[in-house]
Amino acid sequence: MSSKYPRSVRRCLPLWALTLEAALILLFYFFTHYDASLEDQKGLVASYQVGQDLTVMAAIGLGFLTSSFRRHSWSSVAFNLFMLALGVQWAILLDGFLSQFPSGKVVITLFSIRLATMSALSVLISVDAVLGKVNLAQLVVMVLVEVTALGNLRMVISNIFNTDYHMNMMHIYVFAAYFGLSVAWCLPKPLPEGTEDKDQTATIPSLSAMLGALFLWMFWPSFNSALLRSPIERKNAVFNTYYAVAVSVVTAISGSSLAHPQGKISKTYVHSAVLAGGVAVGTSCHLIPSPWLAMVLGLVAGLISVGGAKYLPGCCNRVLGIPHSSIMGYNFSLLGLLGEIIYIVLLVLDTVGAGNGMIGFQVLLSIGELSLAIVIALMSGLLTGLLLNLKIWKAPHEAKYFDDQVFWKFPHLAVGF
């Protein structure tokens, strides 16, 4: 007989998720309405395509990217979809409450859906560090806390530091990475004897993870340009992101071969490193004046990503209990920091060019912004980790980590595991 959820979780999860969904429906009923001013239907379709790209990135890209575990591929894809669906709903409400609410109802536009999808993407990046060790009820908590923390961070940064939509959303890489790592640090770490094989990758799931990486690779220019204000900015962002991810693919594959004693290419390195350029270039993608700079950035990002994938997993596995194939967390933390440093360099060049004493102040503001993002990510991540450790969530036992059969019905299986 195949394994089931413990009875208490079977009672807890549907109740918790459906109650939350009912609460969200009520909030939408009382506090939201659609933007009624859409005169140009052709423009509406064009604008929707950006949101569609982001949804493809989230649902297919990040969904499949995290599906490389031998016995946890179903859960990775479906739980990602579940978190995306829930996260978008809560992010739309939260963004509306934080930015529009004083004027009355929250107006839902395609732009607010775009923002919400990007906020939900943060959870999908973070969750890579904990997938396989938590159940859906715990993931609901993680979605709510992370989307709330990110929404508040963006609001604070927007008000205190005067940053625009793009700039404050580009903290998502660093925020999501540190949030995920701090949650992972709080969860039970050691894998008991006999379950080590479950966090290993398998050929077919690894292929689907590569498919996820390909979708992310294709749509990363859309992600980096989605919140930019003018066509010239979007054009620059798309071009620079494309050049950066193109070079990081070449670097990832050749660097992976270089890093292996027999010159073999590691699937795990490639899954992650192909995206490196897009993350590193994110903050300043619209500002980079020529392709060669974006390409150099892609090269550096690819090398950092491969180097990180080679040397960091051991440390992360010991300290945080993150399996070798879940390298998105530390990858994004390094590359996100690289992106922020590049922007600070641009700030320095700008203020030096202005020839005044503003340089220290502007750099300080930028470092303050980055520090705030990291601090809020760590604090909210630790809070989430502590919440996830509560007994009420009936977390899977360590022996049942990274196992689809804990969560899914497989009719063809005669016996449990």
Partner: antibody, heavy 125, light 106 residues
């Protein structure tokens, strides 16, 4: 030649509604963000609202939030400002203006390089 | 908040005229200058603190960064009368204009 022309102004009672239109010509309208700026009699300029080039994002000055709605129809080269619950303090000349962007080293600078002639809105009982 | 000074000035043809604009917090170089004549729409003079808009005479110049900005007319001409406004675009979406400086010809 690049031109913006407002219409739809007039006299309206407090609490009433009015819709201003602005037709653009001589440039690719869909490639530019657009703004409404107003000027009360004998007063300075006050920025009112903006809309992104693709209509996906909008912003308003606090005093008109929830009452005014900016929109655009790129297929007709038209910009609109729907004004509801009008108050006496909304009396002004309303200008539509085109936004242009210039890349700096660490950020973009935006400016209003083309302005319409203005439409007069009078709110009075 | 953008504060312009003086609020009005009278100058003779050929004079050097300076108008200052102070921001309550840094706007880097995200500042524009406009000229408005009575009954007319505003006209862009300078953007990004110091870049002259095409078609604007070279006697107009802008300088400054951070919180303090200056518009200078090197040699005032009869057609330069009107009201001059500074405007920041650093804090988007809430753009703000200065209260204006009225320039009259003596």
């Amino acid at each position: 030649q690049v031109k913006l022309l407002e219409s739809g102004g007039g006299l309206v009672q407090p609490g009433g509604s009015l819709r201003l239109s602005c037709v653009a010509s001589g440039f690719t309208f869909r490639s530019y963000g657009m703004h409404w700026v107003r000027q009360a009699p004998g007063k300075g300029l006050e920025w009112v609202a903006f809309i992104w080039f693709d209509g996906s994002n909008k912003g308003y000055v606090d005093s008109v939030k929830g009452r005014f709605t900016i929109s655009r129809d790129n297929s007709k080269n038209m910009l609109y400002l729907q004004m509801n619950s009008l108050r006496a303090e909304d009396t002004a000349v309303y200008y539509c203006a085109r936004e242009k962007a210039l890349r700096g080293i660490s950020r973009y600078n935006y400016y209003l390089d083309v302005w319409g002639k203005g439409a007069t809105v009078t709110v009075s009982s | 908040v953008m504060t312009q000074s003086p609020s009005s000035l009278s100058a003779s043809i050929g004079d050097r005229v300076t108008i200052t604009c102070r921001a309550s917090q840094s706007v880097t170089r995200s500042l524009n200058w406009y000229q408005q004549k009575p009954g007319k729409a505003p006209r862009l003079l300078i953007f990004a603190a110091s870049t002259l808009q095409s078609g604007v005479p070279s006697r107009f110049s802008g300088s400054g960064s951070g919180t303090d900005f200056t518009l200078t007319i090197s040699s005032l001409q009869p057609e330069d009368f009107g009201t001059y406004y500074c405007q920041q675009n650093y804090r988007t979406p809430q753009w703000t204009f200065g209260q204006g400086t009225k320039v009259e010809i003596k």
